[in-house]
């Protein structure tokens, strides 16, 4: 009678063999910044160290009575979810607790910052193995909170946080909005986003993935062997902190970028009922539910990629949106999306020595998103090859001409306000995989990369009749690095990658009066690294 | 997950030191910004995190904090330095009147100041 949440994050291979996941996480220290905790609860006794750190505001109300079991309830439950003997995810992980929330579950940004600094200082004084910091709390967007999280992440610490329980865009909250933090939304046993009273889990592009967060069994501070069921994005974040501890115990040298990519890779895909989210947030919200890897094997041989959406550009004519990859990731392609279809494309630019993806709004447009495809590829070296608008009927073309460089993505950008008034190009002739083709009025940008053993292929799926959505997926063993539409006509809203599938969206053609000549194709670039495959075979 | 999300109030004050002479003035044309939580009930006015520029030397945090206290005292304001940050961000946490924000934003090395706000268990 395993609790539903532990079953959900356990891969089918474990369940089929009636295999208990290893008591993993033993090489990892998890810091919990929360309420006080009942450290002698049997679930966590002996595996929790209560630090002397405490930075909490006074409780509200003159008649507030501090009751130990109430003061400890939130933190005790989460400690149990992370590493509880019976109902924990990472049963071997050690825990250190810092009290930053008072008996009413309230704290301050400043108190939490001092807590994060305490962790950094501890790390400098006595460096240990991998560290995971669990922040099961949320406040309004805070520049300083996000900056502190960024610094701690860059010092090699994995930060995991709750997306928030406000049924709102997680980007409006901190630390959920910090790019370096792994932000976790909550789902229930039916894979529905969790409803909490009139509110529920936060969503949007600042959420990295979801995890079980409703009716989660965990240690109760009511007694030393009591359990209680609680719900919230804190519980979801605790699951991911536990999974992270397991992964880091198996591969202690994993970087934050590698860990995040693995969390995404091993998640259950497309199981969440997206109808729960506001319509404009569905495309931005990852449809991923966290799970443990099928075994503690090293997954280093895979080419991992993820999709990063920018903030919305806003509607002004010259507005742009920028999507960035994490520090150790490489931007392999760049695309854009606009709900109105009014956009002027996208391109890869250098910014502070790193490649970024910039999308451009068009006159009369409601704004655009830039979409970066961010990948982990050792010893990669990329450059962008650009062709100016050709003006010729065949359209603009550009290819990767450097020796050993392969095409990982195509972007197009145009200055004209509406490509729809210009004749679209014919489809790219086949047999030229290292080539990007676009509208004759657009400049075309090819992302060309070199890495040991990197090979890529172009996969196209065209539909002769107008369609709201065209998709093309990469086969097993191949990873989607690039996704773009062909041709770049006005009714194309944009292209983006969802897991290993390239999605090209068009306007509802029945309302635009478009003719069937305006067919659309999705072009996927699928890559793999023979070098990584060989390395993994040598490991085994 | 970006640092440039909307719904976040930002008050930019152009800096020009008048009373305190050039020693207190920042580099020409520099601006420090003030931030506070967009969700009003969560604001905690009276406590501020003063964040210094990234390249600021460790010792500068204490020095800037003392400087703020001295200048505030000259104006008849009491301030209390609650914490000095060294290991994550250069800066300090100060309890002071909001009247002193303009003064604090004019201090050398200041990148931005953020009003404290509440966080909640989720």
């Amino acid at each position: 009678s395993i609790p539903w949440n532990l079953e959900r994050i356990t891969p089918a291979r474990y369940r089929a063999d009636e295999y208990q996941p290893p008591k993993g996480g033993s090489l990892v220290e998890v810091y919990l910044l929360d309420t006080s905790i009942q450290s002698d609860h049997r679930e966590i006794e002996g595996r929790v160290m209560v630090t002397d750190f405490e930075s909490v505001p006074e409780e509200d109300g003159t008649r507030f009575h501090r009751q130990a079991s109430k003061c400890d309830s939130h933190g005790t439950h989460l400690a149990g979810v992370v590493s509880g003997r019976d109902a924990g995810v990472a049963k071997g992980a050690g825990l250190r607790s810092l009290r930053v929330l008072n008996c009413q579950g309230k704290g301050t940004v400043s108190g939490t910052l001092i807590g994060l600094e305490f962790i950094r200082k501890s790390q400098l004084v006595q460096p240990v193995g991998p560290l995971v910091v669990l922040l099961p709390l949320a406040g309004g967007y805070s520049r300083v909170f996000n900056a502190a999280c960024q610094r701690l992440a860059r010092a090699g610490v994995v930060l995991v946080t709750a997306a928030g329980n406000f049924r709102d865009d997680a980007c409006l909250y901190s630390p959920a909005s910090a790019p370096e933090v792994i932000t976790v939304g909550a789902t229930n046993a039916q894979d529905q986003p969790v409803t909490l009273g009139t509110l529920g889990t936060n969503f949007g592009r600042c959420v990295d993935l979801f995890a079980p967060g409703e009716d989660i069994i965990g240690a109760s501070s009511d007694c030393s062997t009591c359990f209680v069921s609680r719900s919230g994005t804190s519980q979801a974040a605790a699951h991911v902190a536990g999974i992270a501890a397991m992964m880091l115990s198996a591969e202690p040298e994993l970087t934050l970028a590698e860990l995040r990519q693995r969390l995404i890779h091993f998640s259950a895909k497309d199981v969440i009922n997206e109808a729960w989210f506001p319509e404009d947030q569905r495309v931005l919200t990852p449809n991923l539910v966290a799970a443990l890897p099928p075994s503690t094997h090293r997954a280093g041989w895979q080419l991992f990629c993820r999709t990063v959406w920018s903030a919305h550009s806003g509607p002004t004519r010259m507005a742009t949106a920028v999507a960035r990859c994490a520090q150790d990731e490489e931007l392999l392609s760049c695309s854009s999306f606009s709900r109105s279809g009014k956009r002027r494309g996208e391109r890869i630019e250098a910014q502070g020595g790193k490649r970024v993806c910039r999308a451009h709004n068009a006159f009369g447009g409601e704004g655009v998103y830039a979409i970066a495809r961010c990948c982990l590829l050792p010893q990669v070296n990329c450059s962008v090859h650009t062709a100016p608008p050709a003006g010729a009927s065949m359209g603009t073309r550009v290819h990767c001409h450097q020796q050993g460089h392969v095409l990982t993505g195509c972007s197009s950008h145009w200055e004209v306000e509406d490509l729809g008034t210009h004749k679209p190009p014919v489809l790219r002739p086949r047999g030229q995989p290292n080539q990007c083709v676009g509208h004759r009025e657009a400049s075309i940008h090819a992302s060309c990369c070199h890495a040991p053993g990197l090979e890529c292929k172009v996969k196209e799926h065209g539909i002769p009749a107008p369609q709201e959505q065209v998709i093309v997926a990469c086969e097993d063993g191949w990873t989607l690095t690039g996704c773009s539409p062909l041709p770049g006509t006005s009714h194309v809203l944009g292209a983006y990658a969802v897991d290993n599938t390239c999605v090209v969206r068009s306007r509802d053609v029945s309302t635009t009066g478009s003719t069937s000549k305006e067919a659309v194709a999705a072009v996927a670039i699928c890559c793999r690294s023979r070098h990584l495959v060989q390395a993994s075979q040598e490991l085994q | 997950q970006e640092d440039e999300d909307g719904d976040y109030e930002e008050l930019v004050l152009a800096l020009r030191s008048e009373e305190d002479g050039l020693a207190d003035a920042p580099e020409h044309g520099a601006t420090a910004t003030f931030h506070r939580c967009a969700k009003d009930p969560w604001r905690l006015p009276g406590t501020y995190v003063v964040v210094l520029k990234e390249e600021t030397h460790r010792s500068q945090s204490e020095r800037t904090a003392r400087r703020l206290q001295a200048q505030a005292a000259r104006r008849g304001y009491l301030t209390k330095i609650l914490h000095v940050f060294h290991h994550l961000l250069p800066g300090f946490l100060v309890k002071m009147s909001g009247d002193l924000l303009e003064l604090a934003l004019k201090l050398p090395h200041v990148d931005y100041i953020e009003e404290d706000s509440s966080v909640f268990a989720q």
């Epitope: 009678s1 609790p3 049997r42 679930e43 509880g84 003997r85 019976d86 109902a87 069994i217 109760s220 009511d222 007694c223 030393s224 062997t225 009591c226 359990f227 209680v228 069921s229 | -």
Partner: antibody
Framework: EVQLLESGGGLVQPGGSLRLSCKAS????????INWVRQAPGKGLEWIGR????????RYNEKFKGKATISRDNSKNTLYLQMNSLRAEDTAVYYC???????????WGQGTLVTVSS | EIVLTQSPATLSLSPGERATITCRAS??????LNWYQQKPGQAPRLLIY???NRATGIPARFSGSGSGTDFTLTISSLEPEDFAVYYC??????????FGGGTKVEIK
């Protein structure tokens, strides 16, 4: 050797009260919680409450709040159960039991029979 | 409030046979469940703690298993002195201590 010895049972009039004692020996008295459990004739076990001799903290089954009071005298290594407003249904064998680290009852007294009858 | 349901209420077996008693909790209790033996006219005696650990001095023929909500007490080969009433017990918040209704193991 750990020992718990109850005393104070007997015949009580309905509406009356009585005080049971539990004398502990053979271990550090203040380290272990002591619980009172009763068993009506031919019935199962029913928990009344507990005391932490270290700090005197008590906890009761809601059913017995206001009816039972648990106390201790550390100088005598003795626990007490005061029962008020006794009725016929309070007739039972009353046991004191030591809670090992608060989770299982590793040592029990021999029990003392309380009969409530007119 | 957690309810512990023991089954069967009575078990009629002969010496040397295997006895299996189950205890089902109405809520998740992890592995924090204890088993006691009570003979007529005596106080209960702790047999198994934390679902599967034998208490001091308990013979190896007694074993416990299970976690979560379903637990089993097994006596591999009944001895004459094993005929008694067996209770399961957990800690909860209100009331803090809960006992099962008991299972009587009698001689067939």
């Amino acid at each position: 050797e750990v020992q718990l010895l109850e005393s104070g049972g007997g015949l009580v009039q309905p509406g009356g009260s009585l005080r049971l004692s539990c004398k502990a020996s053979g271990y550090t008295f203040s380290r272990y919680g002591i619980n009172w459990v009763r068993q009506a004739p031919g019935k199962g076990l029913e928990w009344i409450g507990r005391i932490d001799p270290g700090n005197g903290g008590t906890r009761y089954n809601e059913k017995f709040k206001g009816k039972a009071t648990i106390s201790r005298d550390n100088s005598k290594n003795t626990l007490y159960l005061q029962m008020n407003s006794l009725r016929a249904e309070d007739t039972a064998v009353y046991y004191c039991a030591r809670a090992n680290d608060g989770y299982s009852f590793d040592y029990w007294g021999q029990g003392t029979l309380v009969t409530v009858s007119s | 409030e957690i309810v512990l349901t023991q089954s069967p209420a009575t078990l009629s077996l002969s010496p040397g046979e295997r006895a299996t008693i189950t205890c089902r909790a109405s809520q998740y209790v992890g592995s924090y469940l204890n088993w006691y033996q009570q003979k007529p006219g005596q106080a209960p005696r702790l047999l198994i703690y934390d679902a599967s650990n034998r208490a001091t001095g308990i013979p190896a023929r007694f074993s416990g298993s299970g976690s979560g909500t379903d637990f089993t007490l097994t006596i591999s080969s009944l001895e004459p002195e094993d005929f008694a009433v067996y209770y399961c017990q957990v800690w909860d918040s209100s009331p803090p201590v809960v006992f099962g209704g008991g299972t009587k193991v009698e001689i067939k």
